[in-house]
Interface confidence: low
């Protein structure tokens, strides 16, 4: 009798009620291997799931997540809400990364900025909520006369007088200062609704929010359940 069942191909099941005849899988069920005594119910992609591949008599349906969600788990067993870059998903929804952390993806958690000094390097570009810091040469590499192995400075090319160099340096400083002022001004205006959270954040002071904002900071404090941000 077992031999009869082993002849049943994928897409069928060995029907004990019909003298071990191979019966096709009923609608919305499948068998992906031969010799099965039952067909498995097809996976249904409902709610936050959407169908990536329809179920057939020989293979299960495959699901994806609808827009605004991403798959978690093997075979997309769970859909998790997307957040913006610079945020992480908490029990209360999407929350901004705490100062000193970043998330460059729409999923996952905020991770601490790289500590450049651990590798003996200096910070070349400051970190943001969305981006890690960029580490540059070590401070020792930048300071003059730090290494006796430093090659001698090349002779100055004609035309590069000290006056021109001074003028260029001064111009650059003024331009950078103006840029910094504009960025700061823009930042203050943009974030006034957020109570200047990242500019004037005080340790362990919870920002007062008149409304529950979706993207308020997820800085969790010691008394909160989920473990605190180290400020």
């Amino acid at each position: 009798l077992q031999d009869l069942c082993s002849n049943c191909p994928a897409g069928t099941f060995c029907d004990n009620n019909r003298s071990q005849i191979c019966s096709p899988c009923p609608p919305n069920s499948f068998s992906s291997a031969g010799g099965q005594r039952t067909c498995d119910i097809c996976r249904q992609c409902k709610g936050v799931f959407k169908t990536r591949k329809e179920c057939s008599s020989t293979s299960n349906a495959e699901c994806d997540c609808i827009s605004g969600y991403h798959c978690l788990g093997a075979e997309c067993s769970m859909c998790e809400q997307d957040c913006k870059q610079g945020q992480e998903l908490t029990k209360k929804g999407c929350k901004d990364c705490c100062f000193g952390t970043f998330n460059d993806q729409k999923r996952g958690i905020c991770r601490p900025w790289t500590n450049c000094s651990l590798d003996g390097k200096s910070v070349l570009v400051n970190g943001t909520k969305e981006r890690d810091v960029v580490c540059g040469p070590s401070p020792a590499d930048l300071s003059p006369g730090a290494s006796s192995a430093t090659p001698p400075a090349p002779a100055r090319e004609p035309g590069h007088s000290p006056q021109i160099i001074f003028f260029l340096a001064l111009t650059s400083t003024v331009v950078l200062f103006l840029l910094f002022f504009l960025v700061l001004r823009f930042s203050v205006v943009k974030r006034s609704r957020k109570k200047l959270l990242y500019i004037f954040k005080q340790p362990f002071m919870r920002p007062v929010q008149t409304t529950q904002e979706e993207d308020g900071c997820s800085c969790r404090f010691p008394e909160e359940e989920e473990g605190g941000c180290e400020l």
Partner: antibody
């Protein structure tokens, strides 16, 4: 009854190759992702590799990436682990394990609920 | 990669006593993705708890799991002789790699 039976282990020299097999029965094999987990003598468990039910997605631990290849033949209900460029530190008992809940709507990782008895791989000159 | 640290390394207790095993994650893990296993010498691991607190099929109710975020606990309310073994926690969160804790050995005092 769900059963997983590993084979293919043995003694191999450093730099050599070996292919492990895991024969599955008692469940719809293609509906489950499968994993290989190893345990060096007297040590803890280390996840090695995993493969989705369809075989379309594979995952590896950094320690074996580029050397090991996981695959499956759903028509034969068999999981494989091809191990190349073997090193002494790959010496371990290798287990295959059924990895995830087949009830796909579940929002919960169901753990590795069934394991084989393991097969010993010894890499030594 | 998320690192799981189990404590204590060894727990010496007598049958009938309560065992509390700790598992701490290096970063927050969804409780849906934490499992506990028991392993006896010469045997394959056996799933005890999944989803941090759900008992696997056939596991006695003296085993219970709890915790969230970075701290998880496996409790054996009254140790039976067959419970003396090594216990591992395991996480699967934000895709692979899956990682295991280094294990806690529960031995007879």
């Amino acid at each position: 009854e769900v059963q997983l039976l590993e084979s293919g282990g043995g003694l191999v020299q450093p730099g050599g190759s070996l292919r492990l097999n895991c024969a599955a029965s008692g469940f719809t094999f293609s509906s489950y992702a499968m994993s290989w987990v190893r345990q060096a003598p007297g040590k803890g468990l280390e996840w090695v590799s995993a493969i989705s039910g369809s075989g379309g997605s594979t995952y590896y631990a950094d320690s074996v990436k580029g050397r090991f290849t996981i695959s499956r033949d759903n028509s034969k209900n068999t999981l494989y682990l091809q191990m190349n460029s073997l090193r002494a530190e790959d010496t371990a008992v290798y287990y295959c394990a059924r990895s995830y809940d087949k009830y796909w709507g579940s929002s919960m990782y169901s753990g590795m609920d069934y394991w084989g008895q393991g097969t010993l791989v010894t890499v030594s000159s | 990669e998320i690192v799981l640290t189990q404590s204590p390394g060894t727990l010496s207790l007598s049958p009938g006593e309560r065992a509390t095993l700790s598992c701490r994650a290096s970063q927050s893990v969804s409780s849906s993705y934490l499992a506990w296993y028991q392993q006896k010498p010469g045997q394959a691991p056996r799933l005890l708890i999944y989803g941090a607190s759900s008992r696997a099929t056939g596991i006695p109710d003296r085993f219970s799991g709890s915790g969230s975020g970075t701290d998880f606990t496996l409790t054996i309310s009254r140790l039976e002789p067959e419970d003396f073994a090594v216990y591992y926690c395991q996480q699967y969160y934000s895709y692979y790699p899956v990682t295991f804790g280094q294990g806690t050995k529960v031995e007879i005092k």
